[in-house]
Interface confidence: low
Amino acid sequence: FKNDATEILYSHVVKPVPAHPSSNSTLNQARNGGRHFSNTGLDRNTRVQVGCRELRSTKYISDGQCTSISPLKELVCAGECLPLPVLPNWIGGGYGTKYWSRRSSQEWRCVNDKTRTQRIQLQCQDGSTRTYKITVVTACKCKRYTRQHNESSHNFESMSPAKPVQHHRERKRASKSSKHSMS
């Protein structure tokens, strides 16, 4: 089933992200949404990311025989983020432009930040209903990629162990205990 409607929004949330994080820092970003400064505070490697495109998508879910009773609304994170220097004196002499052009093997991309798991009911042709679990994106963020990262990760940001799919226990109905949920 095709999307019935897609509405493009632009994220105006300012998210400071280190431009040269260590690999560990990159992984940790997935846990806190990238909202942190480098250890040295605001230095010349700190960038503010704006312009992350959040596409609101409305679609029906099908498993081939059954179709969702109501359409599903979710966010689709798209596009590259526009990098802007944090400190005002970076803007004047074209330094920022040169800085970024020298790093053509790097790019900032808009990727999934937060997800929520929910249950949806599908109506079947024979009158019965089925319930499925799905994960929908609820927020986007900017993430720095290198060309090597792109090739090795198959373009799946959340393939990194820092941002796995939620523990199965968390995907169960709310009436069940959540003692096994991941920290």
């Epitope: 089933f1 679609k59 879910i61 099908s62 498993d63 081939g64 599903l72 999934n112 997800t115 249950r119 089925r130 319930t131 499925y132 679990k133 799905i134 994960t135 929908v136 994106v137 198959h154 373009n155 799946f156 940001e157 959340s158 393939m159 941002k163 796995p164 799919v165 523990h167 199965h168 226990r169 169960k172 069940k176 205990s177 096994h180």
Partner: antibody
Framework: QVQLVQSGAEVKKPGSSVKVSCKAS????????ISWVRQAPGQGLEWMGW????????RYNRKFTGRVTITADESTSTAYMELSSLRSEDTAVYYC???????????WGQGTLVTVSS | DIQLTQSPSSLSASVGDRVTITCQAS??????LSWYQQKPGKAPKVLIY???NLETGVPSRFSGSGSGTDFTFTISSLQPEDIATYYC?????????FGQGTKLEIK
């Protein structure tokens, strides 16, 4: 009707890798968990891991950590399972399966026989 | 990992018989137990999920019950087409695990 169609049988040498594909049709691929389950000849079923196609998020059985990689290509509605450092005991039929809401498997691929032999 | 112990490992019964297979978990699995039927050379097929729910299209002679750690799968009246191996599977904790299987034969 949902269908999961897997790639053909493979014969591999010990130490090599194998990549099995699973093409889904008839459903919304991005909103599904695809698991991989294997079955050695005459043996039971063993869950290897899953991928959530919408985000690429994965979880693996600890037994296979470091050797198995599950990926997905939304554009072709295809999931992949790659197993490296193959040994003779990896000889098995490998199934992809689509999860229902609470972790049972509603649809299965036809299976791919991987034979590891020198 | 949660261990599932199925019994018996094999059984022989006559057409029309009531057949019972048990599955014991090494810890409470909160009723997240499903049952599969597998015929030779074929992929497994889910019959029962969440302990007692019959999957769409599965004959009503198949049923499941239990709670906590002890679960039972029943075929109320065995049919020739029921000859297969049956597996239980827990989905309460990762990794998902299966019982070792029960091979069902006709006398």
């Amino acid at each position: 009707q949902v269908q999961l169609v897997q790639s053909g049988a493979e014969v591999k040498k010990p130490g090599s890798s194998v990549k099995v594909s699973c093409k889904a049709s008839g459903g919304t691929f991005s909103s599904t968990y695809i698991s991989w389950v294997r079955q050695a000849p005459g043996q039971g079923l063993e869950w290897m891991g899953w991928i959530y196609a919408g985000t690429g998020g994965t979880r693996y059985n600890r037994k296979f950590t470091g050797r198995v990689t599950i990926t997905a290509d939304e554009s072709t509605s295809t999931a992949y399972m790659e197993l490296s450092s193959l040994r003779s005991e990896d000889t098995a039929v490998y199934y992809c399966a689509r999860e229902g809401v609470d972790g049972w498997f509603t649809y299965w691929g036809q299976g791919t026989l991987v034979t590891v032999s020198s | 990992d949660i261990q599932l112990t199925q019994s018996p490992s094999s059984l022989s019964a006559s057409v029309g018989d009531r057949v019972t297979i048990t599955c014991q978990a090494s810890q409470d699995i909160n009723n997240y137990l499903s049952w599969y039927q597998q015929k030779p050379g074929k992929a497994p097929k889910v019959l029962i999920y969440d302990t007692s729910n019959l999957e769409t299209g599965v004959p009503s002679r198949f049923s499941g019950s239990g709670s906590g750690t002890d679960f039972t799968f029943t075929i109320s009246s065995l049919q020739p087409e029921d000859i297969a191996t049956y597996y239980c599977q827990q989905s309460d904790n990762l990794p998902y695990t299966f019982g070792q299987g029960t091979k069902l034969e006709i006398k």
